[in-house]
Interface confidence: low
């Protein structure tokens, strides 16, 4: 399927609008500090060039690879060395090393200002004045802050963003219409970014085999009526799509994702009965819908797994002759029977099965050796079940904010070297598992909770990788993708940690806290809580609770005072002294 001009091929397949949007996303994800106007200029130049190639595929440079064309364009940026430092060295390399170099310099936590939402009228005016620029700015701002955001999905978010403004800027109460929609898009966007970041980490840190195993398990749960051959085909295609997007090949990724959605909808009879509604939607909505579709019903009367995977005399023969296909079949058969298990649990079971066969198929009596392999699964299944039960009970008892605080304390004691903003962000997200998953019935709790925790812990891993400070975090993040959560759960208080020096400045607050939103105020308090634990890692729950209650009362009192700033200064000193006494600092 070779094309004379790859850039012409993708332009024709995707259309000008999507082509331009995807090139903008690609450039913003690579050069995260570049001003918007510079990126727009580069995108327009690439688009004009692509059009010349569409007109004549034999025209000069049209035969060059997309990496060569895009890399050459990025390397024309005048301020590359000043803005990006050593990333400029990438431009001295040839493809494919140059693209790999750009990928390695993607920054998960770029030093960019927080996005502040303007007044609704200001946004509506900007939207009406220049809709195209307004929407491009959205793509640019999201892409540069989330350099691994799933590009075709970002097009779907942009479509919803446009729809929200189109509808709400005409509404009687613009704010009441628009703000909830923007909040929803923001929260969904953060979740989507984090989910995709795990897929890219899986591919880049653990390889294609790890990603394919994840995909076999998840698709088998989702499409339990599909045959193994069908699931295998979907896994192969899905792996290609995500490999491309994670590798910065956004045009190919979006094109292949559209092809995959088309294939799924043309073959839905042999995939799932739940796809009908998705397949009636336009392309971007269709792809999103398929990715989120509920699990199909399990076929009735599935035979016991033991027949093929334990009792059969062919187990070692089958395993030896085609290890990955046999293990893939095991994972497929186990996953389609267990929509109630998390994907990571299913992968742990498959790993245990693989390890057992590796050992037993070399033994004198293989069958005798692996006959009890399914018994080894019991503790692996019970561990997340018990953990979720305990944590959901704690969540129901405390509510989300205090549950987050319990996790903040727990994780700060485990890995106190990690930066306070990272501990706050990660623990707050870990705490959201309660409201997200504990409402579900038993059969849906584990896949919801443990697979969500995998996404959140990956955030910790990628942020920590940028500036590693804890051997324990490095160990849990790198040893095994599927055992990350059990690894972190098993960590006890770090006895080697030398408590942080007490710094009164850390606990000095001002009147500006009174004007913050409830969420931002919580973050301030949670930041103080992490700092407290770092100063006094041996502090008991009761001591910490007492100090936090005093702190909450202090903020409430001073925010009601006439002279707020004086109150914060004077009462703050008293609070610090009382806290030091209470904690023995």
């Amino acid at each position: 399927d070779a094309h004379k001009s790859e850039v012409a091929h993708r332009f024709k397949d995707l259309g000008e609008e999507n082509f331009k949007a995807l090139v903008l996303i690609a450039f913003a994800q690579y050069l995260q500090q570049c001003p918007f106007e510079d990126h727009v200029k580069l995108v327009n130049e690439v688009t004009e060039f692509a059009k010349t190639c569409v007109a004549d595929e034999s025209a000069e440079n049209c035969d060059k690879s997309l990496h060569t064309l895009f890399g050459d364009k990025l390397c024309t940026v005048a301020t590359l060395r000043e803005t990006y430092g050593e990333m400029a060295d990438c431009c001295a390399k040839q493809e494919p090393e140059r693209n790999e170099c750009f990928l390695q310099h993607k920054d998960d936590n770029p030093n960019l200002p927080r996005l502040v939402r303007p007044e609704v009228d200001v946004m509506c005016t900007a939207f009406h004045d220049n809709e195209e620029t307004f929407l491009k700015k959205y793509l640019y701002e999201i892409a540069r802050r989330h350099p691994y955001f799933y590009a075709p999905e970002l097009l779907f978010f942009a479509k919803r963003y446009k729809a929200a403004f189109t509808e709400c800027c005409q509404a009687a109460d613009k704010a009441a219409c628009l703000l909830p929609k923007l909040d929803e898009l923001r929260d969904e966007g953060k979740a989507s970014s984090a989910k995709q970041r795990l897929k890219c980490a899986s591919l880049q840190k653990f390889g294609e085999r790890a990603f394919k195993a994840w995909a076999v398990a998840r698709l088998s749960q989702r499409f339990p009526k599909a045959e193994f051959a069908e699931v295998s085909k979907l896994v192969t295609d899905l792996t290609k799509v995500h490999t491309e997007c994670c590798h910065g090949d956004l045009l190919e990724c979006a094109d292949d994702r559209a092809d995959l959605a088309k294939y799924i909808c043309e073959n839905q009879d042999s995939i799932s009965s739940k796809l009908k509604e998705c397949c009636e939607k336009p392309l971007l909505e269709k792809s999103h819908c398929i990715a989120e579709v509920e699990n199909d019903e399990m076929p009735a009367d599935l035979p016991s797994l033991a027949a093929d995977f334990v009792e059969s005399k062919d187990v070692c023969k089958n395993y030896a002759e085609a290890k990955d296909v046999f293990l893939g079949m095991f994972l497929y058969e186990y996953a389609r029977r267990h929509p109630d298990y998390s994907v990571v649990l299913l992968l742990r079971l498959a790993k245990t099965y693989e390890t057992t066969l590796e050992k037993c198929c070399a033994a004198a009596d293989p069958h005798e050796c692996y006959a009890k392999v399914f018994d080894e699964f019991k503790p692996l299944v019970e561990e997340p079940q018990n953990l979720i039960k305990q944590n959901c009970e704690l969540f129901e008892q405390l509510g989300e904010y205090k549950f987050q605080n319990a996790l903040l304390v727990r994780y700060t004691k485990k890995v106190p070297q990690v930066s306070t903003p990272t501990l706050v962000e990660v623990s707050r997200n870990l705490g959201k598992v309660g409201s997200k998953c504990c409402k579900h019935p038993e059969a849906k709790r584990m896949p919801c909770a443990e697979d969500y925790l995998s996404v959140v812990l990956n955030q910790l891993c990628v942020l920590h990788e940028k500036t590693p400070v804890s051997d324990r975090v490095t160990k849990c993040c790198t040893e095994s993708l599927v055992n990350r959560r059990p690894c972190f759960s098993a960590l006890e208080v770090d006895e080697t940690y030398v408590p942080k020096e007490f710094n009164a400045e850390t606990f000095t607050f001002h009147a500006d806290i009174c004007t913050l939103s409830e969420k931002e105020r919580q973050i301030k308090k949670q930041t103080a809580l992490v700092e407290l634990v770092k100063h006094k890692p041996k502090a008991t729950k009761e001591q910490l609770k007492a100090v936090m209650d005093d702190f909450a009362a202090f903020v409430e009192k001073c925010c009601k005072a006439d002279d707020k700033e004086t109150c914060f200064a004077e009462e703050g000193k008293k609070l610090v002294a009382a806290s030091q006494a209470a904690l023995g600092l």
Partner: nanobody, 115 residues
Framework: QVQLVESGGGLVQPGGSLRLSCAAS????????MSWVRQAPGKGPEWVSA????????RYTESVKGRFTISRDNAKKTLYLQMNSLKPEDTAVYYC????????GSQGTQVTVSS
Amino acid sequence: QVQLVESGGGLVQPGGSLRLSCAASGFTFGSFGMSWVRQAPGKGPEWVSAIDSGGADTRYTESVKGRFTISRDNAKKTLYLQMNSLKPEDTAVYYCTIGRSISRGSQGTQVTVSS
């Protein structure tokens, strides 16, 4: 790429015979047990018969015992189902699958038993 392609279906009178074939590619055919599954109009898939990787151990659903015979040729990477004494209730789309799964895969081959 794992692929299974069935053939040999058709229209046959009650009491007649048909031989279905399933050509496999993309995996080590000789390493896996295989099955035939069928789906009658308006009904769910039903497991019909299975055979182990070497061809020695065969299993059948009660309604086809004594009438159907499953076999395989590992050298040709092909699975067979010989169907004798066919009845109208055998009318269905027949699929071959890997392992003892009762799910439908590929396109299947239509078998219609009618006078």
